[in-house]
């Protein structure tokens, strides 16, 4: 399809690296959420950090290419990494406009399918890129 994908764009303070160059930021007339029009894919992504009491968004934006998962209509996150004990990074990829604005659901920490608490540990910035 010819139309380009538009995704929510967000990068939490302190996150190393940026995916801003994967698209063109749009003027939406509001401060947040920001929107980005993808240059190299028709695929959005989102990364959330799930701890015992809350899920916090870490990054949202465009992927650099279309990959498995990008055909999904909704953001269905799956566990990817452990930035620190007690927290898990969940990522999603999806292929409709603003589909990365929020996730459909997150499994509770420690539930089946979530990497064990002895999974790989990484510095916060590094873990984001592991998740991507």
């Amino acid at each position: 399809p010819p139309n380009r994908r538009t995704c929510v764009f967000f990068e939490a303070p302190g996150v190393r690296g940026s995916t801003k160059t994967l698209g063109e930021l749009l003027d939406t007339g509001t401060e947040l959420p920001r929107a980005i029009r993808c240059l190299y894919s028709r695929c959005c992504f989102g990364i959330w950090n799930l701890t015992q009491d809350r899920a916090q968004v870490e990054m949202q934006g465009c992927r650099d290419s279309d990959e498995p998962g990008c055909e999904s209509l909704h953001c269905d996150p799956s566990p990817r990494a452990h930035p620190s004990p007690g927290s898990t990074l969940f990522t999603c990829s999806c292929g409709t406009d603003f589909c990365n604005a929020n996730y459909s659901h997150l499994p509770p920490p420690g539930s089946p399918g979530t990497p064990g608490s002895q999974g790989p540990q990484a510095a916060p910035g590094e873990s984001i890129w592991m998740a991507l």
């Epitope: 380009r4 749009l26 003027d27 029009r37």
Partner: antibody
Framework: QVQLQESGPGLVKPSETLSLTCTVS?????????WNWIRQFPGKGLEWMGY???????SYNPSLKSRITISRDTSKNQFFLQLSSVTAEDTAVYYC??????????WGQGTLVTVSS | DIVLTQSPSSLSVSVGDRATITCRAS??????????MHWYQQKPGQPPKLLIY???NLESGIPARFSGSGSRTDFTLTISSVQPEDFATYYC?????????FGGGTKLEIK
Amino acid sequence: QVQLQESGPGLVKPSETLSLTCTVSGYSITSDFAWNWIRQFPGKGLEWMGYISFSGSTSYNPSLKSRITISRDTSKNQFFLQLSSVTAEDTAVYYCAGSRYSWFAYWGQGTLVTVSS
Amino acid sequence: DIVLTQSPSSLSVSVGDRATITCRASESVDTYGNSFMHWYQQKPGQPPKLLIYRASNLESGIPARFSGSGSRTDFTLTISSVQPEDFATYYCQQSNEDPYTFGGGTKLEIK
């Protein structure tokens, strides 16, 4: 600053494959940008042909999709155009261009390719 | 593909005059209110040079006498006071949809 330079044969025979090279200086083709080929026909019309991105993904104009291949050599900081089964209608000035966004801020000087027997 | 029609195809003006070139798209080139229309200047033997991006943003180093406006399907490039070095051919380009397409060009000539 980003500089681009096209090179390749100025004359190609009908039904053969047109091959051009774009050499980029002042910027790594793996750092960022889309690296495009654009041609300008003798009547002055411009046509975007396709790109290879910094990550190596490609996008082509559907009108050329069956004939075009864009590739790269990251060690030489070059990217390439191959256009197969050429006809006289492919005679044009061929430009390579770098784009951070979806417009073209950086252009080579262009090279004229004539398709003739 | 989106077809861009420029008018006029040629325009004769005197130095100091105001010049207006229009570009009409066969369908909207806006995404959520952002216009993906761009303008270039080309002189003989040279590649096109970016003047205006996203309808109204002046590229770095381009004189302020150049301006762009418009949205959806109708766009305008204006040169407020034409200078001798402005005599060239001008092209619009859309990037709202793949494939990117260009207008047929407007040649600005000396009257």
